[in-house]
């Protein structure tokens, strides 16, 4: 399958990834998260149509099955297909450390 | 967060593997695919309501923005975890070959 | 465009305290956090610590926990490294630096403060 | 010692390719990403790489980075007499924080 990134939907409507300004309050992360008090949060939005970035053999399998089987099997899904780390100062029972987290902010997208 | 496994939306409603009964003519596999003739294909299925099976942090994120802008960041979506190879009898040029794919099963679920 | 401006060298002796700066512009000062970073001669770059100068929340290095002080004014969008009481030892070529938004990498640093102490 | 390991020295001449390599532990690289500061001499750290495999605008293709497992690397085609610098790798590690490779001498020969 063509592993397409054409979005037949019109420009925009397609698995692909969005920025989203959030603040620590937003993510609910308040209460533990010191730094940074504003993340622009990257995540996978968009409709993932017939071969439309289709992560794998499933996505091709789950799209076919869906046009099948509208009711029972839903479409693939935009989810990440990779991550950029972060790192956040975050509060301690002794004060503030470093934390990386690796799985925090959308890197690229894939349809699942 | 808690990673939760006990559905509140009710039993069997939640993000888990389903499996759906397909012939090479539903997967769209008739052309190249000689055997097997059909598949219990496993997939994932269900709502993800806040914490159940979350991935990651990422997940998480994406639930609370979810919960301030829904019309503009969707809910997390059920997808694999990991997956089950398979081998299929395939049609060459020349004949037959085994060929394994190690994406085309869902193994187990969570949401992201 | 973005600048980190460092204040310049100084000799010192053992003993005496010492102040350096980085002055940042051309970016909002309070949204990246600015890391300290030693170079001693003819040797590889060491991380000392980290700033937020929206909070002043700071985190060092264990090799350098204890012995010098981070700090910043964001009102005159500056950092700061200090020292109470020098030793031979602190010889070296200091440079600050400011972190990328997601605050794994360095994407812009000072020219760096070569600092002398000795006898 | 440094927590990340680079050779000390690579050579080669124009217009050939050279890597530099990065070896850590699965307290740093092995988990996390990696980042490459280039250093001409008596000049401060430039960013060249970050998060394993991505150039900063202004930044020539002629570099890249790739991550396997435990080691990073560091690849500079077409290799020109201005890439004569000292080069560091930099991580994440638990323990420390912010830690860099000990750093590599690239030396343009003829």
């Known amino acids: 399958a063509r592993n397409g990134d054409r979005c037949p939907l019109g420009p925009g409507r397609c698995c692909r990834l969005h920025t989203v300004h959030a603040s620590l309050e937003d993510l609910g992360w308040a209460d533990w998260v010191l730094s940074p008090r504003e993340v622009q949060v990257t995540m996978c939005i968009g409709a993932c149509p017939s071969q439309f970035r289709e992560a794998n053999m499933h996505a091709q399998i789950k799209m076919n099955l869906h046009r099948l089987k509208p009711d029972t099997v839903p479409a693939p899904c935009c989810v990440p297909a990779s991550y950029n780390p972060m790192v956040l100062i975050q509060k301690t029972d002794t004060g503030v450390s470093l934390q990386t987290y690796d799985d925090l902010l959308a890197k690229d997208c894939h349809c699942v | 967060a808690r990673n939760g496994d006990r559905c509140p939306l009710g039993p069997g409603r939640c993000c888990r593997l389903h499996t759906v009964h397909a012939s090479l003519e539903d997967l769209g596999w008739a052309d190249w695919v000689l055997s097997p003739r059909e598949v219990q294909v496993t997939m994932c299925i269900g709502a993800c309501p806040s914490q159940f099976r979350e991935a990651n942090m990422h997940a998480q994120i994406k639930m609370n923005l979810h919960r301030l802008k829904p019309d503009t960041v969707p809910a997390p979506c059920c997808v694999p975890a990991s997956y089950n190879p398979m081998v299929l009898i395939q049609k060459t040029d020349t004949g037959v070959s085994l060929q394994t794919y190690d994406d085309l099963l869902a193994k187990d679920c969570h949401c992201v | 465009e973005v600048q980190l401006v460092q204040s310049g060298a100084e000799v010192k002796k053992p003993g005496e305290s010492l102040k350096i700066s980085c002055k940042g512009s051309g970016y909002s000062f309070t949204s990246y956090w600015i890391g300290w970073v030693r170079q001693m001669p003819g040797k590889g770059l060491e991380w000392m610590g980290v700033?937020?100068?929206?909070?002043?929340?700071?985190i060092y290095s264990p090799s350098f926990q204890g012995q010098v002080t981070i700090s910043a004014d964001k009102s005159i969008s500056t950092a700061y490294l200090q020292w109470s009481s020098l030793k031979a030892s602190d010889t070296a070529m200091y440079y600050c630096a400011r972190y990328g938004r997601y605050g794994t990498y360095f994407d812009y640093w000072g020219q760096g403060t070569l600092v002398t102490v000795s006898s | 010692q440094s927590v990340l390991t680079q050779p000390p020295s690579v050579s080669g001449a124009p217009g050939q390719r050279v890597t530099i390599s990065c070896s850590g532990s699965s307290s740093n690289i092995g988990v996390l990403y990696v980042n490459w500061y280039q250093q001409l001499p008596g000049t401060a750290p430039k960013l060249l790489i970050y998060?394993?495999?991505n150039r900063p605008s202004g930044v020539p293709d002629r570099f890249s980075g790739s991550k396997s497992g435990t080691s990073a690397s560091l690849a500079i085609t077409g290799l020109q007499a201005e890439d004569e610098a000292d080069y560091y790798c930099?991580?994440?590690?638990?323990?420390?924080?912010?830690?860099f490779g000990g750093g590599t001498k690239l030396t343009v020969l003829g």
């Open positions: 998060s394993n495999d």
């Open positions: 930099q991580s994440w590690d638990s323990s420390s924080n912010y830690v």
């Open positions: 700033i937020d100068p929206s909070g002043s929340y700071t």
